[in-house]
Interface confidence: medium
C-alpha cells in the first residue's frame, strides 16, 4: 500500500543511574544501543496494525519504547494500557520523523502487559502493538493448595495463593493403590474449585501454573480399611487449616461417626457430616474434622469412632516450622557395569519438597513417593553407568538438605599415555583404583619383562568433572631408558590393560596398545 | 458509522451462567477497544471489562475476576461477555460500548442498547 | 483503583438555569483521562466531554468539562428541558476504569 507510512520500532534499554527519572525525553540515564523490534505489519487484520517483537524485560529495569514514522504532516497519538489511556507526545526528530516514546521505569509486573499504540497521520490511522513482558520469575509463587468449607455448603473449595493466578483441578480416584496413579483410568480430573462430592476413595486438589504444579491430598482414615501397620502422622505449620476426613461403610443406615482429640469430643464448628447411599444401597458416611488454623495445642491423637466400625486414630503434630529429616551422611556405591541399582533417599518433610538429582552439574527430574510409615522415598536410577558425584537436594519453604552419593562402576583399566622430553605418563580410569607396573623393551627383554622400579611416581587425581578416580603413573627419563620402547600397565581385580611408548624425543608416541585380560 | 446490536433479554437461574452478545455494524471492529459495563435497577454504571478484538488483550475489574468472560470473535464483529456463578445482585442492564480514538481519546463513544439479565429461582 | 465520588448527589434546577456538577478521584487522573456521560431512563449513557474538556461529536456548546489532577466538573451553561438526566464522571487512564455514582439533575 503506497500510502502506508514507514514505521520503525525500537527498544532501549537504560541503565539506571539511581536517578530519579522522569518521562521526558532527558532522563538522567547511560543507554545502550537502540534494538530493533522490526514492527511488522499484520496480514488479515481490520485495519491497519503493526506488531512489534515481544520485549522481555528484567524486573526493575528501564525501557524506552519508541515508534519512529516516517509519513508527511502532523500526527496524533494515543497509548492505551490494560484498557487505560496513557498520555502521548509525539515530537519531530532532525530527518523529520515522528518520535513517539513510552518510558517504562523500573519495570514491575503490574507494567507487563500489551502496550498499543494509536496513530493519526493526515493521510492515515494505524495501531501498533507492543508485548512487554518481565524476564525472569522471581516475582511468581506456587503455594500449596489448601482446603476451605464452602458457607453454607457441604462443599470444599480448594485455594492455592500463587502468582501468576493458578488453575485449580480436584483430582479423584475411587479405587485404591496404584490403581490412583496420576494416568490412571481410574482417576478423574475436575477443572474447578469447588468441590461437592466428597465421598470418593482418594482426594486431592492441585494447583498449577507457569512454575509447575503443587498437590494437597485430603487426609483420610478409612474405617473399612484395615488400619495401617503405623500410625497415620499429619504435619501442619502454625496458622494452617487442618482437615481429616473419616469414612465408613455400613450396610444400613444405623450408625454414627464421632472425632475425638486426645479423647475429647471436638467442639461444634470443627466438624460436619454427610451421608449418601452407594450403588449397593449400602450406607456412606464421612466426617470432617476441621480447625481453619490450628495452633500448638490442636496436636494429639484424632480418633475416629463409630457404632459400627473398630475406632482408628491419627497423630496430628503442629510444628513452628517446616523440616526434612533424613541422614546427610555422604554415601558410597560400587556395582559391576551392567548391574541393575538406584540410589534412593529416605526422609519425612513438611511441607512437601521440591528435589533436584544433579550428576556433573546437569539436573535431573526428582520423583517422590509416600510409604505408609509416614517416610517418603526419592529414587534415581538413570544413571546410565556413569561413575561419579550425584547430588541429591531437596527443600520446602523452611529447609534444605543435601546429600552426596559416590557411584563407582567396576571394570578393568583403561590406558592413555603421553611422553614429554624428560617423561612418560601414563593414566588409567577402571575400578577398582589400579596398581601400575613399568616395564623396559630390549634385546635382552624382546617381550618386555624387564621390570623398571627407579624414577616410577604414582598418584591418584579426582577428575574433577565427573567426580571419578582417574590413576596415573609417571615415569621420569633416565639415560638408562632413553631411546627404548617401555610399556606401562594397570591392573585391578578384572583385568589389565597396557601401552607402549617409544622413548626417545618430545611428545607422545604410543606405539603399541596392549590388552590383557 | 458504527452500531452495537446486543443480543435480548435473559432470565437466569442463581448459580448458572450467562452470555451477552454484542455485535458491530459499520466502521472498523478490531482495533477498537468494547467494554463491558452493567446498570443495576436504580443504580449506577459498574465497569467489568473489556477486550481490544485485534489483540484479543483483555482487562476486567478485580470485582468480577475469576466469574467474567470476555471474548471476541473478529470474523463476526462481535464481542461477547460470559458471567458465571450468578447470583441475584447480578440482576441489571450490561451495556456493550466501544471506545473512541479519534482526536486520541479512548472514552466510550458508542453504546449498544443494553441486556438485561434477571437473576431469579 | 481510583474512587470518583460526585457531587451534589441530585441538583435541583429550572430551565435556563446553570448547573455545576463536581467529579472528585481519589488518585490523580492521568493526563486529564476523564470523561462525562449523560443517561436518560430506559436509554444507554452518551459521551459528552472526553479528555476532561473536549466535546464529542454533535454535542452542544452549552456542556463543558474542565479541571485536572483530582478535580473535575461539568458545566451546563443554560439548561435545556432535554438536559435533565442523570450524569456520570469515569476515568479511564488507571486500570480498571470506575465510573462517579452519578448526579441527578432534575426539574426544580
Known amino acids: 500500500n503506497q500510502d502506508l507510512p514507514v514505521i520503525k520500532c525500537v527498544l532501549i534499554n537504560h541503565k539506571n543511574n539511581d536517578s530519579s527519572v522522569g518521562k521526558s525525553s532527558s532522563y538522567p540515564m547511560v543507554s545502550e544501543s537502540p534494538e530493533d523490534l522490526g514492527c511488522a505489519l499484520r496480514p488479515q487484520s481490520s485495519g491497519t496494525v503493526y506488531e512489534a517483537a515481544a520485549v522481555e524485560v528484567d524486573v526493575s529495569a528501564s525501557i524506552t519504547l519508541q515508534v519512529l514514522v516516517d509519513a508527511p504532516g502532523n500526527i496524533s497519538c494515543l497509548w492505551v494500557f490494560k484498557h487505560s489511556s496513557l498520555n502521548c507526545q509525539p515530537h519531530f526528530d532532525l530527518q523529520n520523523r515522528g518520535v513517539v516514546s513510552m518510558v517504562i521505569l523500573k519495570m514491575t509486573e503490574t507494567q507487563a502487559g500489551e502496550y498499543l499504540l494509536f496513530i493519526q497521520s493526515e493521510a492515515t490511522n494505524y495501531t501498533i502493538l507492543f508485548t512487554v513482558s518481565i524476564r525472569n520469575t522471581l516475582l511468581y509463587t506456587l503455594r500449596r493448595p489448601y482446603f476451605r468449607k464452602m458457607e453454607n455448603q457441604d462443599a470444599l473449595v480448594c485455594i492455592s495463593e500463587s502468582v501468576p493466578e493458578p488453575i485449580v483441578e480436584w483430582v479423584l480416584c475411587d479405587s485404591q493403590g496404584e490403581s490412583c496413579k496420576e494416568e490412571s483410568p481410574a482417576v478423574v480430573k475436575k477443572e474447578e474449585k469447588v468441590l461437592h462430592e466428597l465421598f470418593g476413595t482418594d482426594i486431592r486438589c492441585c494447583a498449577r501454573n507457569e512454575l509447575g504444579r503443587e498437590c494437597t491430598r485430603l487426609f483420610t482414615i478409612d474405617l473399612n480399611q484395615t488400619p495401617q501397620t503405623t500410625l497415620p502422622q499429619l504435619f501442619l505449620k502454625v496458622g494452617e487449616p487442618l482437615w481429616i476426613r473419616c469414612k465408613a461403610v455400613h450396610v444400613n443406615h444405623g450408625f454414627g461417626l464421632t472425632w475425638e482429640l486426645e479423647n475429647k469430643a471436638l467442639e461444634e464448628g470443627n466438624y460436619f457430616e454427610m451421608s449418601t447411599y452407594s450403588t449397593n444401597r449400602t450406607m456412606i458416611r464421612i466426617l470432617f474434622a476441621f480447625v481453619s488454623s490450628v495452633a500448638r495445642n490442636d496436636t494429639g491423637y484424632y480418633t475416629c469412632s463409630s457404632s459400627k466400625h473398630p475406632s482408628q486414630s491419627a497423630l496430628v503434630t503442629i510444628v513452628e516450622k517446616g523440616f526434612i529429616n533424613a541422614t546427610n551422611s555422604s554415601e558410597d556405591y560400587e556395582i559391576d557395569q551392567y548391574e541393575e541399582f538406584c540410589f534412593s533417599v529416605r526422609f519425612k518433610a513438611y511441607p512437601q519438597i521440591r528435589c533436584t538429582w544433579t550428576f556433573s552439574r546437569k539436573s535431573f527430574p526428582c520423583e517422590q513417593k509416600g510409604l505408609d510409615n509416614g517416610y517418603s522415598i526419592s529414587k534415581f536410577c538413570n544413571h546410565k553407568h556413569q561413575p561419579g558425584e550425584y547430588i541429591f537436594h531437596a527443600e520446602n519453604d523452611d529447609a534444605q538438605f543435601t546429600k552426596m552419593f559416590t557411584l563407582n562402576i567396576r571394570r578393568k583399566p583403561q590406558v592413555l599415555a603421553e611422553a614429554s622430553a624428560s617423561q612418560a605418563s601414563c593414566f588409567s580410569d577402571g575400578y577398582p583404583l589400579p596398581s601400575w607396573t613399568w616395564k623396559k623393551c630390549s634385546d635382552k627383554s624382546p617381550n618386555c619383562t624387564e621390570e623398571i622400579t627407579e624414577g616410577v611416581w604414582n598418584r591418584k587425581a579426582n577428575r574433577k568433572v565427573f567426580g571419578q578416580w582417574v590413576s596415573s603413573s609417571t615415569l621420569n627419563m633416565s639415560e638408562a631408558i632413553k631411546g627404548f620402547l617401555v610399556k606401562c600397565c594397570a591392573y585391578n581385580s578384572l583385568g589389565t590393560s597396557c601401552e607402549t611408548i617409544l622413548l626417545n624425543s618430545p611428545g607422545p608416541f604410543p606405539f603399541i596398545q596392549d590388552n590383557i585380560s | 458509522q458504527v452500531q452495537l446490536v446486543q443480543s435480548g433479554a435473559e432470565v437466569k437461574k442463581p448459580g448458572s451462567s450467562v452470555k451477552v452478545s454484542c455485535k458491530a455494524s459499520?466502521?472498523?471492529?478490531?482495533?477498537?477497544?468494547i467494554s463491558w459495563v452493567r446498570q443495576a435497577p436504580g443504580q449506577g454504571l459498574e465497569w467489568m471489562g473489556g477486550i481490544i478484538p485485534i489483540f484479543g488483550t483483555v482487562t476486567y475489574a478485580q470485582k468480577f475476576q475469576g466469574r467474567v468472560t470476555i471474548t471476541a470473535d473478529e470474523s463476526t464483529r462481535t464481542a461477547y461477555m460470559e458471567l458465571s456463578s450468578l447470583r441475584s445482585e447480578d440482576t441489571a442492564v450490561y451495556y456493550c460500548?466501544?471506545?473512541?480514538?479519534?482526536?486520541?481519546?479512548?472514552?466510550?463513544?458508542?453504546w449498544g442498547q443494553g441486556t438485561l439479565v434477571t437473576v431469579s429461582s | 483503583e481510583i474512587v470518583l465520588t460526585q457531587s451534589p448527589g441530585t441538583l435541583s434546577l429550572s430551565p435556563g438555569e446553570r448547573a455545576t456538577l463536581s467529579c472528585r478521584a481519589s488518585?490523580?487522573?492521568?493526563?486529564?483521562?476523564l470523561a462525562w456521560y449523560q443517561q436518560k431512563p430506559g436509554q444507554a449513557p452518551r459521551l459528552l466531554i472526553y479528555?476532561?474538556?473536549s466535546r464529542a461529536t454533535g454535542i452542544p456548546d452549552r456542556f463543558s468539562g474542565s479541571g485536572s489532577g483530582t478535580d473535575f466538573t461539568l458545566t451546563i451553561s443554560r439548561l435545556e428541558p432535554e438536559d435533565f438526566a442523570v450524569y456520570y464522571c469515569?476515568?479511564?487512564?488507571?486500570?480498571?476504569?470506575?465510573f462517579g455514582q452519578g448526579t441527578k439533575v432534575e426539574i426544580k
Open positions: 460500548a466501544r471506545d473512541s480514538w479519534s482526536g486520541a481519546t479512548g472514552a466510550s463513544d458508542t
Open positions: 459499520g466502521g472498523t471492529f478490531g482495533s477498537y477497544g
Open positions: 479528555g476532561a474538556s
Open positions: 488518585h490523580s487522573v492521568s493526563s486529564s483521562y
Open positions: 469515569q476515568q479511564y487512564g488507571s486500570p480498571p476504569r470506575t
